[in-house]
């Protein structure tokens, strides 16, 4: 039961995390105009990974996409790549983890297969979360560097008379969404890996015979063979690493002696 709960919770947490990574990637507020210690303007600037926007006090908002690839800073391209890799890995991980869920039965999938799929999805979630955290952190570092550079020469005077106020940018909402989402995906991945250890059955060194109870088409497996239902042509006994007598419907699981993490 604990394994199913851990796996289910890991899936839900990862799902929320990946949704957050997608949201952060699409958001326009990666960097927002710094309002502190600046003259109050009627225009507010903010930028995302894909476009920059200007919101006027009148309520009018205008956004312009970055219609160039070569002209963009390498760091921005790297952040885009990290976020997209994170989303792709996360999406594949979600797909794999759906089939790996203990509460979902697909044909006669063995526990070992589910364990492997759970581990795979867990690793994918961890890498996905790390990609998102790395992407957001790289962007944040870029902002901090630019912020202090623009602060150093915030007012570039022309003959001491005319001043040009340089727009400084600070952390936008998307950064915080990205950090939280990446963290959640990472946590979800770890939970999936923990659940995998519980799903992976113990290897036994003895053979067992499959007994068919009369009147029932459910095979009883006291040892290392998988119970097979009478549906379809799945009547062959299949060897799995299982340490105890269990039917397919039971949720009790045993820790594996193999370290999958």
């Amino acid at each position: 039961m604990a394994v199913t709960a851990c796996q289910g919770l890991g899936f839900v947490v990862s799902l929320i995390g990946i949704a957050g990574i997608i949201a952060a990637t699409c958001m326009d507020q990666w960097s927002t105009q710094d309002l502190y210690n600046n003259p109050v303007t009627a225009v507010f600037n903010y930028q995302g990974l894909w476009r920059s926007c200007v919101r006027e006090s009148s309520g009018f908002t205008e956004c312009r996409g970055y219609f160039t690839l070569l002209g963009l800073p390498a760091m921005l391209q790297a952040v885009r790549a990290l976020m997209i890799v994170g989303i792709v890995l996360g999406a594949i991980g979600l797909l794999v983890s759906i089939f790996a869920l203990k509460c979902i039965r697909i044909g006669s999938m063995e526990d070992s297969a589910k364990a492997n799929m759970t581990l795979t999805s867990g690793i994918m979630f961890i890498v996905s979360g790390l990609c998102a955290i790395a992407g957001v952190s790289v962007f944040a570092n870029m902002l901090v560097t630019n912020f202090w550079m623009s602060t150093a020469n915030m007012y570039t005077g022309m003959g001491g008379m005319v001043q040009t106020v340089q727009t400084r940018y600070t952390f936008g909402a998307a950064l915080f969404v990205g950090w939280v989402a990446g963290g959640l995906t990472l946590i979800g991945g770890v939970m999936m890996c923990i659940a995998c250890r519980g799903l992976a059955p113990e290897e036994t060194n003895y053979k067992a015979v499959s007994y068919h109870a009369s009147g029932h088409s459910v095979a009883y497996k006291p040892g290392g063979f998988k119970a097979s239902t009478g549906f379809g042509s799945n009547t062959k006994n299949k060897k799995i690493y299982d340490g105890g007598a269990r039917t397919e419907d039971e949720v009790q699981s045993y820790p594996s002696k193999h370290d999958y993490v």
Epitope: V40, A42, Y46, G59, E62, V165
Partner: antibody, heavy 118, light 113 residues
Framework: QVQLVESGGGVVQPGRSLRLSCAAS????????VYWVRQAPGKGLEWVAV???????NYADSVKGRFTISKDNSKSTLYLQMNSLRAEDTAVYYC????????????WGQGTLVTVSS | DIVMTQSPDSLAVSLGERATINCKSS????????????LAWYQQKPGQPPKLLIY???TRESGVPDRFSGSGSGTDFTLTISSLQAEDVAVYYC?????????FGQGTKVEIK
């Protein structure tokens, strides 16, 4: 057709209060910002205050703390509550609508004269 | 506050001739986010409220004759009347629409020579 009509001007003693109104028609106050701009006799234009479509307000330093801009969206009316009036507040007060994009005043009222004198 | 300085204070031009009014702001009115200049030009005739001519430093308001044009960026702006007409006699104001409080220039009076 967009129209702005100011009212409430008159002669008032220094230190007293006065409330100006601006009736707007042809547009809604929930969609556009509206300004108060004044012009002292024989002088140039001076921006006074603005209330934006969302209700946010901004003021000129010379009137901050004394004047309050507000609006009644249901009545489509803009107000300027002027307290602690001074002789230098004597001017023709215009209300003007913000055009929306790139922030400029595209429609103006005819103005109402406020005279602060003892 | 942002100081808007217009030059000259008054200008006498012959009918059909070009009139040029300059406006200088104490800080740049160019927004880096959209590369737009937040500056407007107004015309005020005696006994009338001001009328918007140009916004965004160079965009002509609808209904404004094309002899009026605006140019400039950052801190230096120009209003040009390519061929002065009798009805163009008025006071012209530039206005900062970027920094609060929005400030006007002192005005330039255009007369016929």
């Amino acid at each position: 057709q967009v129209q702005l009509v100011e009212s409430g001007g008159g002669v008032v003693q220094p230190g007293r209060s006065l409330r100006l109104s601006c009736a707007a028609s042809g547009f809604t106050l929930t969609s556009y910002g509206v300004y108060w701009v004044r012009q002292a006799p024989g002088k140039g234009l001076e921006w006074v205050a603005v209330v934006w479509a969302g209700g946010n307000t901004n003021y000129a330093d010379s009137v901050k703390g004394r004047f309050t801009i507000s609006k009644d969206n249901s009545k489509s009316t803009l107000y300027l509550q002027m307290n602690s009036l001074r002789a230098e507040d004597t001017a023709v007060y215009y209300c003007a609508r913000d055009r929306g994009r790139l922030l400029a005043m595209d429609y103006w009222g005819q103005g109402t004269l406020v005279t602060v004198s003892s | 506050d942002i100081v808007m300085t217009q030059s000259p204070d008054s200008l006498a031009v012959s009918l059909g001739e070009r009139a040029t009014i300059n406006c200088k702001s104490s800080q740049s009115l160019l927004n880096s986010g959209n590369q737009k200049n937040y500056l407007a030009w107004y015309q005020q005739k005696p006994g009338q409220p001001p009328k918007l001519l140009i916004y965004g430093a160079s965009t002509r308001e609808s209904g404004v004759p094309d002899r009026f044009s605006g140019s400039g960026s950052g801190t230096d702006f120009t209003l040009t009347i390519s061929s002065l007409q009798a009805e163009d006699v008025a006071v012209y104001y530039c206005q900062n629409d970027y920094f609060f409080p929005f400030t006007f220039g002192q005005g330039t009076k255009v007369e016929i020579k």
